[in-house]
Structure formats: C-alpha cells, structure tokens
C-alpha cells in the first residue's frame, strides 16, 4: 500500500550511493541547454551623443549544452548527514540549435567602460580613465562576437589601466574549467524532509551580499526538493547565478510525458519593490537607481560581481517597473516566454522539467569626466542578453519513472 511506497520513496530519494536519486544527482540524466538572445543596439551614436532611448533588437537563440559534467569532490559526512560537492561549469556550442555562429557580431554596451566608470567614481581617477578610454579608441558601445561577449576578450582600455586589474572581460568569464561551490547539502539519511536542502555554500550559511534575511541560503538548488511536495508549499531555492535565494509557488497541474507534475513558478511578488512586498526591503541596496526603493523587477548584484554594476532581471524586463524599461525601445515582455518555472514530480520532489529565464543588464551612468559618457542625461540599465536554461526528462527516463514511481501509485 501507500506506506510501502512512501517507505520506498524515502529510501530512494536519499543522496547516497546506490539510490536512484544519487545516480541522477551526481550526473544529470537530462540534457540541459542554455539559449542566449543578445540585445543588439541599433543606435549607438544617437545614445552616446543625444542620450536617446536605446533601440535594441534581440538576436538568437544561440544554444549551448550545459550541466553535462558530473559533480566533483563528492564527499559524504556521516556525522551531520550531509554530502558536499563542486558543480563544474562547462558549455558546448550547438550550431544546429542556433541561428548563427559564435563568430556573429553584436553592438553592445562597452562592459569595461560602464564598469570602470561605476567602480572608480573619484573625479581625478575618472579623468585618468577618460584618457585611457580615448587612447584605446574605446567608446560607450563596442562590437563583439558572441564568443567574446560570453566567454571573454582582452579589453583594449583595461589593458592600458595602470592599476593591477584583470584585463579580460566577458559576461560569463571565467566559465569553462571553473566550478560552482563548494555546496554542502543534507543527504536525507536522518530526516528525509531535509534532503537536498543546502546546509552551507562556500562554507557559509549566508552570502555576505545582502542585509538581514535576504542574505540567507534557503532551500535546495532547485534540481530537486524534499519528497511529497504539496501544492500549498512555497518552494525555496538558491541560485548562485543571481546571488540570492528565491522561491516558487504552485501554478497548475501539468502532464509531462504521462507523469503528473506540479508546475511551480516564480511569482511577480518575488520581484516587487519593498512598497508592495516589504520582505524585499533588504534587496534594495541603494536609493538613487532604485528611486528610493520604489523601482522593481531588477536586482543589483554588484556586491556579488566585484563592484561591477550588474543588474539581473527577467527577460525583456518582465515584472519590472515602467521606469526601468522606459529608456529602452524594442522590448516585448510576455509571461509565457519570459518567466521561470519548475515542473516537479510531487512524490519524489524531483524537478523533471524546468525553464530558468533571466536577463543580464549593466548600469551605465553619465560621467562629467569621461567623454564617451558625458552627453548622457540619465542612468540606463542596459540589457545585454537574456537566457533560457531548459531541461526536460528524456522519453526513456520518463518511461522508467512512470513504471517505477507514478505507475505504482496510480
């Protein structure tokens, strides 16, 4: 009966050698793809000279296979019933799933100019930067290939900077041959309701990026949740990509390849301003760009990015306040394409399908001392790209899952 099934499930979702969960956890059996759409700026001169609205045109998808590498340094700790690991990063370009090649060119914000002018706010230092920007023939915008933009290029301006700075710039640099973690998660041996929940990340229970509860590492990494998921639950998870913990709420029942799953979505409330959602007060880290914490839908993660003014949002500024998208033309947010969802099999707590969508933006501000930013009359949160990371259980795995789990219950 049900008790026997519960017992079996509890046994099989423990993260230890020999369980179904462990096998799929160490190396995901699902093919995961990350699609990128790049925002190609159509009017760079008008923006730089007249502070016009930035006209963007998204180009994509450019698709990479990701999360194909097995977890590394997997170490069980019998004393506190945890397992620690590193999640290695790797990306392989998939030409057949892409609209072009990694050599395609895009006009994008000059990442180094925007970041340096934000990090070094001293007026005299900005004059020095101005001289180097001009000497290197850099501007507010630049033309870069997809490969350069994502994975890194040697920046000509930074190469002249007399400070000891990293001269390689890229939105995901460094990526290949790096790893995320160390994660230490509960293996569920002593308490199945804690399985996969993160105990520590990089040796700590908090991030040191935010104040108060915003700084906590909550829940799992979203690949799985403790079993017997209820529709009423708020599922907490941590995403190192956005340097914070976030949550998902039940939206609908979905049938995935014959398996009943619960679709959990990230609600607009998670991106709301503290005015609408007081819990979010600690994600508002400054008062000017956020218009005294009334703006919403963008997250300043600069503390997590060595001071670089990176802002994370949903694609096309979905769920963001009008003031954020007002200076940008060419955006068309819609929930179906741009929200994040997780399809969770409720008995095991396994995420069998997901779509993680986010947008990477960079803040650029007027600067009296930097000539290429001098004519700007306002701050811009400039969209650089958005991504859609997806994974769906394979047909073979789905058949096995149906026969071993859901079939036995139904």
């Amino acid at each position: 009966g049900d008790l026997l099934i519960q017992k079996t499930i509890k046994k099989q979702v423990v993260l230890e050698e020999g369980t179904i969960a462990f096998k799929n956890w160490v190396k995901t059996g699902t093919e995961v793809y990350r699609q990128f759409w790049i925002f190609d700026v159509q009017n760079p001169q008008e923006v730089m000279m007249n502070s016009s609205n930035i006209q963007v045109k998204q180009r994509g998808p450019y698709t990479y296979r990701v999360r194909f590498l097995a977890k590394e340094n997997v170490t069980q700790d019998a004393e506190d019933n945890t397992v620690s690991f590193l999640q290695p990063n790797g990306a392989i370009f998939e030409p057949s799933l892409s609209v072009g090649t990694e050599a395609d060119n895009f006009t994008v914000l000059n990442l180094a100019v925007a970041a340096a002018s934000h990090i070094y706010q001293n007026q005299f230092v900005q004059m020095i930067l101005n001289s180097l920007i001009n000497k290197s023939k850099s501007s507010m915008f630049q033309v870069r290939t997809l490969r350069e933009l994502l994975w890194g290029y040697r920046d000509p301006f930074l190469s002249l900077v007399p400070y000891p700075v990293t001269t390689t710039v890229g939105l995901f640099y460094p990526y290949n041959n790096t790893a995320d973690g160390v994660y230490k998660v509960f293996n569920g041996k002593d308490n199945i309701s804690k399985v996969a929940i993160i105990d520590t990340y990089k040796g700590k229970r908090n991030l040191s990026y935010w104040e108060s509860h915003c700084d906590m590492i909550n829940g799992t990494d979203a690949a799985s949740f403790p079993p017997f998921v209820e529709k009423s639950q708020v599922l907490q998870f941590f995403s190192s990509d956005i340097c914070r913990s976030i949550y998902a709420v039940f939206e609908s029942d979905v049938n995935l390849k014959g398996i009943p799953v619960y679709r959990f979505v990230l609600p607009s409330k998670a991106f709301a301003s503290p005015v609408e959602n007081p819990d979010n007060y600690c994600f508002c880290t400054e008062k000017i760009i956020s218009k005294n914490c009334t703006s919403y839908g963008v997250l300043d993660i600069s503390k997590c990015k060595e001071g670089r003014p990176v802002y994370i949002s949903l694609p096309h500024f979905l769920y963001a306040s009008p003031d954020v998208s007002e200076p940008i033309d060419g955006l068309n947010p819609n929930e179906e394409e741009h929200r994040t969802y997780l399809d969770i099999e409720p008995i095991t707590g396994f995420t069998l399908q997901f779509a993680k969508r986010l947008q990477v933006n960079l803040l650029v501000k007027p600067s009296e001392k930097i000539q290429v930013l001098k004519n700007l009359k306002r701050n811009y949160i400039v969209p650089i790209l958005w991504l859609n990371e997806t994974g769906t259980i394979g047909d073979e795995k789905a058949n096995m899952f149906r026969s071993q789990v859901t079939g036995k219950i139904n």
């Epitope: 001293n122 007026q123 005299f124 230092v125 020095i128 001289s131 000497k135 000539q371």
Partner: antibody
Framework: QVQLQQPGTELVKPGASVKLSCKAS????????MHWVKQRPGQGLEWIGE????????NYNQKFKGKATLTVDKSSSTAYMQLSSLTSEDSAVYYC?????????WGQGTTLTVSS | DIVLTQSQKFMSTSVGDRVSVTCKAS??????VAWYQQKPGQSPKALIY???YRYSGVPDRFTGSGSGTDFTLTISNVQSEDLAEYFC?????????FGGGTKLEIK
C-alpha cells in the same frame, strides 16, 4: 612623444591681464583634460583648475574663480589661461598638464612677473 | 579644503641610504594620493599614484604607502640624482591640494 610648449616668461604691469598659452602636440588634444597649476618662487604647488578641450567644460579651485579663465582652441591644440587684475601675488610659474594617467606630462612652465 | 602637511621641509641623507618622506592629510582621502618629484629648475614629475602604485619608468627604489590620512614615500638606496623636492597631492576631493614639499639634500 607628448610635448607642451609654454612661453618661458611674461612680464606684465599690475592691474593688467595676461593670457598664458600651452600648445600641445604628440597626442589627441581633445581626449585629455588639461590642468593648470601655480607655483610661487620657493613655495608649494596650487591647483588652479581643469578644462575638457572636447567641449570646454571647466572646474575651478574656488580661490581662483574670477582670477583665472580657462579656454581652448581646438584647431591649434592650444590651451589658454587668462589671469586678470594682476598683482604681485600672481607672480609665479604656471604649469599646464594634461591628465594622462596622472599629472606626469607637465609643461616647462611660464614664469609670470607682475611689476611696474 | 583638505590640507596636506609635510612636516619636514628638509631632509638630509647619504647615497645608498633609505629615507622616508611623510605626508599627513587633514581628513580621510582614502588612497587618492600622488607623489611628485621636482628637481631644481625643472617641472614636477609624477612618481606614484593611488598612494602606492609606481608610474612606468619610475625606479623601484621609490615606494609609496599609506591610506586614510597618513602617507609615506620611501626612497631606498638613495642616488645622487634623487636630489629634489618631493610633493604629495590629494585628488580625493576638489580643490586638489598639494603638500608644502620636502627637499631632499644629499650629504
């Protein structure tokens, strides 16, 4: 090779005005802010102000507002500083210096003597 | 205005010695300090920026240190060509100000 040509000396009478020049070569004149610094004989250095040659935007040390006026002529890559209502206190060496990572390229300076 | 005090107007040293020139700011200027060398009859030359970074071409016997309000320029293994006046400058806030200078004399 960055070069800044300043006249060696200027002799003017009290109450008069003088326009000191600084002709730049060896770099893109409009790309670098130009600073002016005063040094009285046997004394320290005083920052007067700065000008962006690309659009003539200026910032002054409050102490020199009304005394010094900074301008540029882009066509000849020359920066100017006009000093008005001169007194003996204005007798000094005046340096121009473009900001390329720091005040490391200074002109040789113009020695201004205010005397009747 | 931020006042930079170089308490020693003159310093006497011998070739091969090590000498430290100090500069004290009237308020916190972070590391936004530069050091200049002015030889007799010449215009100043920049040695150090951001309190501790040498300009290219500056011999490594010149070392800058300090942050906040206290800064030091150290010349190790003094050479005869180091006979000069040394000025500190803050560029933390307008107006940029200079110290009164320290003259280095070689015995």
């Amino acid at each position: 090779q960055v070069q800044l040509q300043q006249p060696g000396t200027e002799l003017v009478k009290p109450g008069a005005s003088v326009k000191l020049s600084c002709k730049a070569s060896g770099y893109t004149f409009t790309s670098y802010w130009m600073h002016w610094v005063k040094q009285r004989p046997g004394q320290g250095l005083e920052w007067i102000g700065e000008i962006d040659p690309s659009d003539s935007h200026t910032n002054y040390n409050q102490k020199f507002k009304g005394k010094a006026t900074l301008t540029v002529d882009k066509s000849s890559s020359t920066a100017y500083m006009q000093l008005s209502s001169l007194t003996s206190e204005d007798s000094a060496v005046y340096y121009c210096a473009p900001i390329y990572y720091g005040l490391d390229n200074w002109g040789q300076g113009t020695t201004l003597t205010v005397s009747s | 205005d931020i006042v930079l005090t170089q308490s020693q107007k003159f310093m006497s040293t011998s070739v091969g010695d090590r000498v430290s020139v100090t500069c004290k700011a009237s308020q916190n200027v972070g590391t936004n300090v530069a050091w200049y060398q002015q030889k007799p009859g010449q215009s100043p030359k920049a040695l150090i920026y951001s309190a501790s970074y040498r300009y290219s071409g500056v011999p490594d016997r010149f070392t800058g240190s300090g942050s906040g309000t206290d800064f030091t320029l150290t010349i190790s293994n003094v050479q005869s060509e180091d006979l000069a006046e040394y000025f500190c400058q803050q560029y933390n806030s307008y107006p940029y100000t200079f110290g009164g200078g320290t003259k280095l004399e070689i015995k």
